[in-house]
């Protein structure tokens, strides 16, 4: 007789979840020398101990605290960008801009990068049918406390000026409920943190608009400053070229405005 | 217990190959990260390469890139090295471990020598 399994809204854990950790841990290392000193097989056995046999709605960041430990790596505190709603640009700029670092570079962040999990209570089983739903099921999911305990630690080593990378093409291009707007923001350190500056991206050709401007930036701004940090932001007005003069600075088109 | 039993080594000339293989038991082969590692004479332990348990990815120390491969038999819980273009430099007694790249050298076997020499 099968045993009864809790639905949940989500979809379940990735397929061959704890394959794809494992090749993406074994890959890093080697892209990255500094971190050979890593044991895939005791970083993975950190991160199965996490959620496994735990309820998938009673999750803590100290569940997570032994996969931390192991994982610990220095990045440079003055070349940390940040994003929210606009992940694949950041991503595409750090593989361009190699000094600079977003989360998913880190191993980390690497390795659970659009992937799900999850497990059930008492059994060592890994749950590939359904996981928790953040707002339909519960937030103390093995996936939300994954990466807001990792923002945290990551906001937390952040240095000098800051850059955070906006999609201003969003109705909200701040979102106070994004993991940069509820857990990023608030755990910059001011003793450390000098200035974060937004890069707010623009998704028409022709919007020429400053999106600085915007309710919701003068909201982080507002935010930002009680915190006793200071706060730029600059419109990038044309992606595509901004990448391109990131590639090639010396290009004659990108000394103008992009 | 864990027990892990390398074999395959020898005596070759520069430019042969050998392939060497690591039997396993007494833990869930299958489950497992396997990778192989070198000890010179008079030198410390170094890293040459990493699987993981399905095979999907392998990854190597940069001098043994492109002539040294890492598979595995999870039917016959055996890692095996096809070590091609032998160099002098790569004289060593040859390990096999669970986990890795990097981590505790916890389990091991006896090893089993690669002399490259002419």
């Known amino acids: 007789v099968p045993r009864w399994r809790q639905q949940w809204s989500g979809p379940g854990t990735t397929k061959r979840f704890p394959e794809t950790v494992l090749a993406r841990c074994v890959k890093y290392t080697e892209i990255h020398p500094e971190m050979r000193h890593v044991d895939c097989q005791s970083v993975w056995d950190a991160f199965k101990g996490a959620f496994i046999s735990k309820h998938p709605c009673n999750i803590t960041e100290e569940d997570y605290q032994p996969l931390m430990k192991l994982g610990t790596q220095t990045v440079p505190c003055n070349k940390i960008l940040l994003w929210s709603r606009i992940k694949d640009l950041a991503h595409q700029f750090t593989q361009v801009q190699r000094d600079m670092f977003t989360l998913e570079d880190t191993l980390l962040g690497y390795l659970a990068d659009d992937l799900t999990w999850c497990g059930e209570f008492n059994t060592s089983k890994i749950n590939y049918q359904s996981c928790p739903d953040w707002r339909k099921d519960c937030s103390n999911n093995p996936v939300s406390v994954f990466w807001k305990t990792v923002s945290r630690r990551f906001a937390e080593a952040a240095c000098d000026v800051v850059h955070v990378m906006l999609n201003g093409s969003r109705s909200k291009i701040f979102d106070k409920n994004s993991t940069f707007g509820s857990v990023e923001v608030h755990n910059l350190q001011p003793e450390k943190v000098q200035t974060l500056e937004a890069w707010v991206i623009h998704g028409g050709r022709e919007d020429s608009r400053d999106l600085c401007q915007d309710p919701t930036i003068k909201e982080l701004e507002s935010i930002i400053s009680k915190r006793n940090i200071q706060f730029s932001c600059k419109n990038i007005y044309r992606p595509d070229k901004f990448l391109q003069c990131v590639k090639n600075p010396e290009d004659s088109s990108c000394t103008s405005e992009i | 217990q864990v027990q892990l039993v390398e074999s395959g080594g020898g005596l070759v000339q520069p430019g042969g190959s050998l392939r060497l293989s690591c039997a396993a038991s007494?833990?869930?082969?299958?489950?497992?990260?396997m990778s192989w590692v070198r000890q010179a004479p008079g030198k410390g332990r170094e890293w040459v390469s990493t699987?993981?348990?399905?095979?999907?990815?392998?990854s190597y120390t940069e001098s043994v890139k492109g002539r040294f491969t890492i598979s595995r038999d999870n039917a016959k819980n055996t890692l095996y090295l096809q070590m091609n273009n032998l160099k002098p430099d790569d004289t060593a007694l040859y390990y096999c471990?669970?986990?890795?790249?990097?981590?505790?050298?916890?389990?091991w076997g006896q090893g089993t020598q690669v002399t490259v020499s002419s």
């Open positions: 471990r669970i986990g890795g790249p990097g981590g505790r050298y916890d389990n």
């Open positions: 007494g833990f869930i082969f299958s489950d497992k990260v």
């Open positions: 699987i993981t348990p399905g095979g999907t990815a392998t």
